[in-house]
């Protein structure tokens, strides 16, 4: 029972995590315009992995895709790659883990095969989660570096009265979605690996049986040892776990209904 629950919960947690990774990858708010300590602008900028957007105070939003591959920063390309690898591994992991679920019967699939599939999907989820966490962390590091660089020379062209204010970017909602989703996928993967250890058939030890023949004795040992990963009870109880993920785009909101500018 505990093994089925662990496996089912691992699957659900990973499913939510991968849905979160997909959502984060598609979200436009990886970096958002820093509003703190900046002149109050009537335009709000935010950027994703695939396009950058501008929302005017009128409500008009315009997004432009990055229609170039070579012109993009290597770091952004790396983040894209990590997130896509994470999604692909996670999707394959989900597919494998569906067939590995103890509560789902497929033909005469042996428990040892299910155990192997559970372990495989678990490892895939772990790597998927790590890819997402790495991707988001690389992007966050890039933001922090750029933030302090733009703070250092926030006002350029100070030779005269004219000032050009540089737009500084800070962490967007997608980063937090990505971190949480990556963590959930990682946890789900670990749970699948733990479940795997209890899924394989328990060791069956056959005692040696002696057959006495005339003249001399021969010891015959049939069967030997069946391969097993060890502990955990095998249960036939079936429990289906269901889960879903829901993400919402960050909406720029005013601190209060009345603003003085």
């Amino acid at each position: 029972m505990a093994v089925t629950a662990c496996q089912g919960l691992g699957f659900v947690v990973s499913l939510i995590g991968i849905a979160g990774i997909i959502a984060a990858t598609c979200m436009d708010q990886w970096s958002t315009q820093d509003l703190y300590n900046n002149p109050v602008t009537a335009v709000f900028n935010y950027q994703g992995l695939w396009r950058s957007c501008v929302r005017e105070s009128s409500g008009f939003t315009e997004c432009r895709g990055y229609f170039t591959l070579l012109g993009l920063p290597a770091m952004l390309q790396a983040v894209r790659a990590l997130m896509i690898v994470g999604i692909v591994l996670g999707a394959i992991g989900l597919l494998v883990s569906i067939f590995a679920l103890k509560c789902i019967r497929i033909g005469s699939m042996e428990d040892s095969a299910k155990a192997n599939m559970t372990l495989t999907s678990g490892i895939m989820f772990i790597v998927s989660g790590l890819c997402a966490i790495a991707g988001v962390s690389v992007f966050a590091n890039m933001l922090v570096t750029n933030f302090w660089m733009s703070t250092a020379n926030m006002y350029t062209g100070m030779g005269g009265m004219v000032q050009t204010v540089q737009t500084r970017y800070t962490f967007g909602a997608a980063l937090f979605v990505g971190w949480v989703a990556g963590g959930l996928t990682l946890i789900g993967g670990v749970m699948m690996c733990i479940a795997c250890r209890g899924l394989a058939p328990e060791e069956t030890n056959y005692k040696a049986v002696s057959y006495h023949a005339s003249g001399h004795s021969v010891a015959y040992k049939p069967g030997g040892f069946k391969a097993s990963t060890g502990f955990g009870s095998n249960t036939k109880n079936k429990k289906i776990y269901d889960g879903g993920a829901r993400t919402e785009d960050e909406v720029q909101s005013y601190p209060s209904k009345h603003d003085y500018v």
């Epitope: 602008t41 009537a42 335009v43 900028n45 501008v54 005017e56 105070s57 000032q163």
Partner: antibody
């Protein structure tokens, strides 16, 4: 077609309060910001602030925060600006305008309300 | 607040002439996110409310004659009327619509000889 109809001219005494109205028609009133602008001869145009009738969100120019108060009645598609503690400096033409969807600028204007403050 | 400086304060021209007027802002009105300049030009004829001519520094309002052209970027902007007509007699204002509070220039009064 989009129209902003403002209330008629007002003659007020110093220290009094006045409420100017701006009735919108021809578009979804709740979806656009209504701007208030002051125009005095020799002083050009001054932005007082804005209100989004749908949410009640308001932004005031710091200069006018103690002078103007914005409200909106979505049932009658009317925006209001109340000016308090009137002085002769408040004598001006007051315009309401709609902030257009593009460019943050004002695409339709009311005809203006002339306010005269005199003892 | 952003200071918008318009020049000249007035100019007198004959019909058919080309006219340029300038508007300078104390800070850049260029938004790096979409590379648009948040500057608007308005025309105010005597006894009328202002009318939007150009927004995003160079985008002409629908219905505005193509003799009106907006140009410039960052802090320096220009409104050009390629061939002035008698009906262009008005005061022209530029407006910062990037930073709150929105601010207007003092205006350029165009007079026809």
């Amino acid at each position: 077609q989009v129209q902003l109809q403002q209330s008629g001219a007002e003659l007020m005494k110093p220290g009094a309060s006045v409420k100017l109205s701006c009735k919108a028609s021809g578009y979804t009133f709740t979806g656009y910001w209504i701007e208030w602008i002051k125009q005095r001869p020799g002083h050009g145009l001054e932005w007082i602030g804005e209100i989004l009738p749908g949410s009640g969100s308001i932004k005031y120019n710091e200069k006018f925060k103690d002078k103007a108060t914005f409200t909106a009645d979505t049932s009658s598609n009317t925006a209001y600006m109340q000016l308090s503690s009137l002085t002769t400096e408040d004598s001006a033409i007051y315009y309401c305008a709609r902030k257009g969807l593009r460019g943050n600028s004002f695409d339709y204007w009311g005809q203006g309300t002339t306010l005269t403050v005199s003892s | 607040d952003i200071v918008m400086t318009q020049s000249p304060s007035s100019l007198t021209v004959t019909a058919g002439e080309k006219v340029t007027m300038s508007c300078k802002s104390s800070q850049s009105l260029l938004n790096s996110g979409n590379q648009k300049n948040y500057l608007t030009w308005y025309q105010q004829k005597p006894g009328q409310p202002p009318k939007r001519l150009i927004y995003w520094a160079s985008t002409r309002e629908s219905g505005v004659p193509d003799r009106f052209t907006g140009s410039g970027s960052g802090t320096d902007f220009t409104l050009t009327i390629s061939s002035v007509q008698a009906e262009d007699l008005a005061v022209y204002y530029c407006q910062n619509d990037y930073y709150y509070p929105f601010t207007f220039g003092s205006g350029t009064k165009l007079e026809i000889k």
